[in-house]
Every structure is written in C-alpha cells, then in structure tokens.
Interface confidence: low
C-alpha cells in the first residue's frame, strides 16, 4: 500500500520536479539542473537555484562599492558547482578551464585563474547590504512603518529569523536593508541570509521562485512600495583577494 501524495509540488521552489517517492510516499522534489533533493519547507540554496536557472539570460551589472571590501555580482549568471548540501563549492570553473574562488553566496572573490588555482575554504558572506530605490510617491514612507513591513516580509515570506535583519535605513527614495549572520550565529535550520537575499532579489524583479504564490505585493500602510532599482553588496568574513589592477580599474 502506498500513500502517494495527491498534489505533489514544491511550495518554496518552482524550479523543481516532484514525485511521490519520498519516505512513506511523501512528495519528494528535486532541483532542475542538479537533480538534488530539496527541502520544500524552507528556501532552496542559491547555488541550486542558479544551477536550475542556467537557461536564463545573462544579467551583468556594475555597482559603486559602499566599502573597500564589499563585493557585487558583476559576473552575472554562471553554471555553478554545488556541494552535496547544495552550497557553492569554493572553487568554480567554466568550460574553458578558467577558475575563480567564490564566497558563500557564489560571488567571485578572487581574480580568475587556471585549473591550478586553489580555494582553500568557502568564505562566508556575513553581511549583506540590499540597496533599493523606490518609485516616487506622494510623500516619504514613515520610517518605522517601512522598517516593520520589511522585517515582517523577511520573517514571514523568507522565514529569516528577525535577529538576522540588522537594520533598515531610509532616506527617500533610498532604502537599505542590512542582513548580518556570522557563522557562529547560524543554527541548524536557520535560513541563510544569502538565500533570503536571493529570493528577495528575484521577488523584487517579478521573478518569484515560490510555486503558485502571487508575486511580491509590498505595501506600507496600504501604499504600494514599487522598487525601480536594486543593488546588493556582499561583505565576507575574510576580505576578498583581487590584484591591484582590478582594484584601481
């Protein structure tokens, strides 16, 4: 006798294939691209999502850095190597044997090299700054209302523990959300700030990763919050290692 599930889908990741072959006939979902089993009660890791998304168009961008060690994702999409837990492998290489080191959110943190390049460890991104500019509104949003709404969003939509939302800054029209999560603070089962930031980024772009859920409808006291630009800065526990040539470019 089986107990095959009637409606087998992954609420937290639409980029999956699901079938009732999990324990006890429960729905088991595998990420497209990697075929890895994912836990549909929480966010899927960014590495597995990027791997699944590889058919999407390249989306490169260049940002102004808020501090000398902050990283931005200038390289756009690539087909990443993920470890058995779905995390980024410290060293990533492309089809032409060009390799580089990445941090825990998959952003390059060294110059590109060849197959001899060594990346000793996956360096954790412990501080993420999400910089948003909203469309003009009749007046500025109330800062405390905006703060509360964004904290609620990260808690309820992305299941990120409130303690990891360090601050919400607002100077119309710029909103900055600071996420902080040291290795020592992240308990088993805690959503990773990198994964939450990636889901948020895709939501803001109208590319929600959630299955069947409506797109993100952000409102502050009933007033729609429409984002027209998003920049995300990543700070690692160990500063990145780029040559002077890149730093002065």
């Amino acid at each position: 006798h089986t107990a095959a599930q009637d409606n087998c889908t992954c609420p937290t990741n639409k980029m999956t294939v699901c079938s009732p072959d999990g324990p006890g006939g429960r729905c088991q979902c595998r990420a497209l691209g990697s075929g890895m089993a994912v836990d549909c009660s929480t966010l899927t890791s960014k590495c597995l999502l990027l791997k699944a998304r590889m058919s999407a168009p390249k989306n490169a961008r260049t940002l102004v850095r808020p501090s000398e060690h902050a990283l931005v994702d200038n390289d756009g999409l690539y087909d990443p190597d993920c470890d058995p837990e779905g995390r980024f492998k410290a060293r990533q290489c492309n089809q032409t044997s060009v390799c580089w080191c990445v941090n825990s959110v998959g952003v390059r943190r060294t110059d590109k090299g060849d197959l001899s390049l060594r990346c000793d460890e996956l360096v954790r991104t412990h501080h993420i700054l999400i910089d948003l500019r909203h469309r003009p509104t009749a007046g500025a949003f109330n800062h405390s209302d905006l703060d509360a709404e964004l904290r609620r969003l990260f808690r309820e939509r992305y299941r990120l523990h409130p303690k990891f939302v360090a601050a919400v800054h607002y100077e119309q029209p710029t909103i900055q959300i600071e996420l902080r999560q040291n290795t020592s603070q992240k308990a088993a089962g805690d959503v990773d700030i990198g994964d939450a930031a990636y889901y948020f980024e895709r939501d803001i772009k109208g590319e929600s990763l959630f299955q069947g859920r409506g797109g993100l409808d952000l409102r502050v006291r009933g007033e729609p919050l429409q984002v027209e630009r998003t920049l995300i800065y990543y700070l690692d526990e160990i500063p990145p290692k780029f040559s002077m040539k890149r730093l002065t470019a």
């Epitope: 107990a3 599930q5 409606n7 889908t9 072959d21 324990p23 429960r26 089993a37 549909c40 299941r159």
Partner: antibody
Framework: EVQLQQSGPEPVKPGASVKMSCKAS????????MNWVKQSHGKSLEWIGY????????GYNQKFKGKATLTVDKSSSTAYMELRSLTSEDSAVYYC????????????WGQGTSVTVSS | DVVMTQTPLSLPVSLGDQASISCKSS???????????LHWYLQKPGQSPKLLIY???NRFSGVPDRFSGSGSGTDFTLKINRVEAEDLGVYFC????????FGGGTKLEIK
C-alpha cells in the same frame, strides 16, 4: 510553544459522520505535515493519513481511504478530519500529530479526540 | 505494509534498573536517501504519545540522556538506563521509511 488543541469527545450513531478539529499554535502551520493517528481502546496506534497545509496535499493509509477525509483551514491554522459511515469499529481516540520534515517523525501530538459509536 | 514487532509485550523493572526493548521490522528501514526513519514514542497513562528518539538514535529535545536508541536495517533497540518512576508507560517503535506503521507497544511497569 508548539500546541495542538483537539476538539472534544464525540458520541455518534452508527452510519453517521463526524468532523473533528485540531488547532495548531506556536509554529508556522503551513510548514509542517499534519498526521492523524487512530488508537482503539487499549490497542496500538494506526496511521490514518497526512495533509500538507501549504498546498493541501494529502496521503492516506489504504485502509482509511473512503473512511477519512483530511482538510485544513490555513487562515485559522486548523486541521480537520471527517470520518463517515461510522461503525463500532471506528470507536477510538484520534490524535493529530505534527510531523517534522527533517526526520519524518511526529514530534508534537494533540491530546486526542474520543469518538464513541453507539446506537 | 511493514510489520513492526516489539518485544517484550510487558517489561517489569525495578527503579534504577536498566530496561531494554526490541523492535524488529519485516523489511529494511533504510530509505533510498540513506536515512533510517525508525522512531520511539512513549505514551504515559492517560496522555498522548510523545516523541523520544528519532532516526534510530537521536534524542528529541528535552529527552534525558538515559534514553538511547541503536540498531540498523531491521533490528532496533531502545535502552533506558536507571529507570525512574516518570518513565513508566507504553513504548512504541514506529517507522516512516515506508507508509507509517507502529509496533504493538511495550508496557514498562514496576516489578
């Protein structure tokens, strides 16, 4: 604190139906499977089925297909089980139990709803 | 369905003694993902069951370390070191690798 509060005892007549409830609190209701388990007087436990509140997905023990129907109301974080065409064999205590998706075990149980089928 | 056979049916012990309960399954409980979904529950008189051990040997939160689980494949054991009065009740093993099934229960009582 995780709590599952079940509805009170149900004396019912043979052939009738009964719908019992299980109100969840202290956690995100939609993130966990809810299981239902039957315990006949002085006997072991029998798994009836589960429902995943996030999308309403259900799975049933073959023995209880057609006997039990599982539903949820997400707005009130409540799971329901309806039993139909009741006979004396259905007299038992019925438990709802939350299942953790990491270890597939029932980590929190309701206090049980006693159903007595008698004419 | 997978049949879970518990022995003994009744286990009289003296307080402070060690107790051991066996649970055998009619087929292997190793899932294709490598996990073994074998769990132990305790049902005290007049109460609902409570989770003690999950996935063979992991104590659930708040469960004292005098409880330990072991085994693999089809043979599993629950051990209780230094039995206390609050440990009395019926112990059930259960598997969720296949469609959920429970053992018949073992009643731990005072000798």
């Amino acid at each position: 604190e995780v709590q599952l509060q079940q509805s009170g005892p149900e004396p019912v007549k043979p052939g009738a139906s009964v719908k019992m409830s299980c109100k969840a609190s202290g956690y995100t209701f939609t993130d966990y499977y809810m299981n239902w388990v039957k315990q006949s007087h002085g006997k072991s436990l029998e798994w009836i089925g589960y429902i995943y509140p996030n999308n309403g997905a259900t799975g049933y023990n073959q023995k209880f297909k057609g006997k039990a129907t599982l539903t949820v109301d997400k707005s009130s974080s409540t799971a329901y089980m309806e039993l139909r065409s009741l006979t004396s064999e259905d007299s038992a205590v019925y438990y709802c139990a939350r299942e953790d998706s990491y270890y597939y075990a029932m980590d929190y149980w309701g206090q049980g709803t006693s159903v007595t089928v008698s004419s | 369905d997978v049949v879970m056979t518990q022995t003994p049916l009744s286990l009289p012990v003296s307080l402070g003694d060690q107790a051991s309960i066996s649970c055998k399954s009619s087929q292997s409980l190793v899932h294709s993902n490598g996990n073994t979904f074998l769990h132990w529950y305790l049902q005290k008189p007049g109460q609902s069951p409570k989770l003690l051990i999950y996935k063979v040997s992991n104590r659930f939160s708040g469960v004292p370390d005098r409880f330990s689980g072991s085994g693999s494949g089809t043979d599993f054991t629950l051990k209780i070191n230094r039995v206390e009065a609050e440990d009395l009740g019926v112990y059930f093993c259960s598997q969720s690798t296949h469609v959920y099934t429970f053992g018949g229960g073992t009643k731990l009582e005072i000798k």
